[in-house]
């Protein structure tokens, strides 16, 4: 079955609420040590307000202050640098809101973008120069935040230098990261410093650190992963899909639907037929006529399109494609003009002896 | 077909030194990590010196560190190893080898290897 | 340092045995392991890698698992030509071989 990004499911599906997660790039608040720092959570309509730093709940204390929507951090140091969250919880849902705070004497900046070079992964060893463990690449790890779609990938890089060579594992939420603490397990590539987690799931979410260490020191890097669950939704249909037809009486002709759905959905292809010369029965609802639906011998290319050969005038109307899944039901149009053959006389159009 | 050829090897006298090199084709040399690797007659294999795929660092296993010098020429795809101060226990068959395509998905193992060229240190 | 240990060093079976060679890491190497075929007077071929990976062009009989600290290359139907020594080598910070199974024929 053809597969949907998030970012189409937004604009196939304009009516639907846009996803309530922080996709992009969190807000980095900076501050020298000894400075105070104030945060204002930025959400709207929030009756509650709970606050995280680097995935653990955040409570008051001699130097952190909560009051209403706002975060005041007095007397900052380097502890206080971290990803902060504030949750609104609402009677019907949740948002919430990331940001950084990086409390240092010198700040860097960079893009966390795919590789392109892999020079700066490495730092030439002086094969007489021992040396505790040092990132080589710090722009690759910016970005801390990670808000991915459920069943794509994610990597994580701490790219590193130190001799003797030094070693990297890895922890979730402060505990050691087994294989077998996630289905599919994961991967490390130690030549790019990274851990890869391939099929997210809702299960992934938290905090993942690199751990880099070799005899001399030890150094570590805290990301947070938080997987964005695909809302379900009724079919989608493509646009413009079926589109409209015309043939002369004799030909063929063939509308085609393309069904895009999470949840396995039912076709039908529908033809609106008139009864007694009415379009329309007693309850308003129109009269239809059930022409093709997925079986148990049919594919699913077989249901997206619809064969009607030898056209008639009785052909000429209006059909339906109808998908529905456990979510709901979608359906598109299409008219078929049927055009007299070229030196035949106009046929007689018949009422359909078969209702449904 | 990925090709790895290593020369310069032969007999040496303790203490002196001798230069390996390896000329590389049927691949994007510059992408791959490289590395020499080591067999002592009738014994096990033995990592030896590691370059990453641009030259940017390299490391050593600690029997060899200030002595062996691996380097890399990417525009000539070569590999080179200076081995100073040799020891008796240096004896052995040489390979080169390919240590991971840096722009795959590929990792440090050692995908493809060089036929191996004997050094022997001796008086 | 990271330590591997291969079991057995020596290892005889008929063709047709399903072999089983064993590797131990003295600590969690994260499947970052290789397991490498080498025959009398050549240079080793690489067969696994990633623990379970079948690197291209190398027989389906051979397969890789294990994760942690416990790795086993299987060899489900023994043939002639498999007759060689086989070596695990981590590469999980830094390059580690193990000592080597040598396979013959009974």
């Known amino acids: 079955r053809p597969s949907f990004s998030l970012v189409e499911d937004t604009t196939l599906e304009p009516e639907e609420p846009p996803t309530k997660y922080q996709i992009s790039q969190p807000e980095v608040y900076v501050a020298a040590p000894g400075e105070s720092l104030e945060v204002r959570c930025l959400l709207k309509d929030a009756a509650v307000i709970s606050w995280t730093k680097d995935g653990v709940h955040l409570g008051p204390n001699n130097r952190t202050v909560l009051i209403g929507e706002y975060l005041q951090i007095k007397g900052a140091t380097p502890r206080d640098s971290g990803l902060y969250a504030c949750t609104a919880s609402r009677t019907v849902d949740s948002e919430t809101w990331y940001f950084m705070v990086n409390v240092t004497d010198a700040i860097s900046s960079g893009d966390d973008e795919d590789d392109t070079d892999g020079a700066e992964d490495f730092v030439s060893e002086n094969s007489n120069n021992k040396r505790a463990p040092y990132w080589t690449n710090t722009e690759k790890m910016e970005k801390r935040l990670h808000a991915v779609p459920a069943a794509n990938t994610v990597k994580f890089r701490c790219p590193a230098g130190g001799n003797p060579m030094p070693t990297m594992r890895w922890l979730k939420n402060g505990k050691e990261f087994k294989q077998e603490h996630r289905i599919g397990g994961y991967k490390v590539r130690n030549q790019h410093w990274s851990l890869i987690m391939e099929s997210v799931v809702p299960s992934d979410k938290g905090n993942y650190t690199c751990v880099v260490e070799n005899e001399y020191g030890s150094i570590n890097h805290t990301y947070h992963l938080d997987v964005v669950e695909r809302s379900p939704h009724r079919p989608i249909l493509q646009a413009g899909l079926p589109a409209n037809a015309s043939t002369v009486v004799g030909g063929d002709v063939e509308f085609v639907c393309k069904v895009y759905s999470d949840a396995q959905p039912h076709i039908q292809w529908i033809k609106h037929v008139e009864k007694n010369g009415s379009k329309y029965g007693p309850d308003g609802l129109p009269y239809l006529k059930v022409l093709k639906a997925a079986g148990v011998n049919t594919t699913d290319k077989e249901i997206e399109v619809l064969y009607i050969r030898n056209v008639t005038f009785e052909d000429a109307g209006e059909y339906t494609c109808l998908a529905g899944n456990s979510i709901g039901i979608s359906f598109h149009s299409a008219w078929l003009t049927v055009l007299p053959a070229p030196g035949r006389e106009k046929e007689i159009t018949a009422s359909p002896d078969y209702l449904e | 077909e990925v090709q790895l050829v290593e020369s310069g090897g032969g007999l040496v006298q303790p203490g002196r030194s001798m230069k390996l090199s390896c000329a590389a084709s049927?691949?994007?040399?510059?992408?791959?990590?490289m590395a020499w690797v080591r067999q002592a007659p009738k014994k096990g294999l033995e990592w030896v010196a590691f370059i990453s795929h641009d030259g940017g660092s390299s490391y050593y296993r600690d029997s060899v560190e200030g002595r062996f010098i691996i380097s890399r020429d990417n525009a000539k795809s070569t590999l080179s190893l200076q081995m100073d101060s040799l020891r008796s226990e240096d004896t052995a068959t040489y390979y080169c080898?390919?240590?991971?395509?840096?722009?795959?998905?590929?990792?440090?193992?050692?995908?493809?290897w060089g036929p191996g060229i004997m050094v022997t240190v001796s008086s | 340092d990271i330590q591997m240990t291969q079991s057995p060093s020596l290892l005889s079976a008929s063709v047709g045995d399903r072999v089983t060679l064993s590797c131990k890491a003295s600590?969690?190497?994260?499947?970052?392991l290789a397991w490498y075929q080498q025959k009398l007077g050549e240079a080793p071929k690489l067969l696994i890698y990633?623990?379970?990976s079948l690197q291209t062009g190398i027989p389906s009989r051979f397969s890789g698992s294990g994760s942690g600290t416990d790795y086993t290359l299987t060899i489900s139907s023994l043939q002639p030509e498999d007759v060689a020594t086989y070596f695990c080598q981590k590469y999980y910070s830094g390059w580690t071989f193990g000592g080597g199974t040598k396979l013959e024929l009974k």
């Open positions: 049927g691949l994007t040399f510059s992408n791959y990590g």
């Open positions: 990633d623990a379970d």
């Open positions: 080898t390919t240590a991971g395509d840096y722009y795959s998905d590929n990792d440090w193992y050692f995908d493809f």
């Open positions: 600590q969690s190497i994260y499947n970052s």
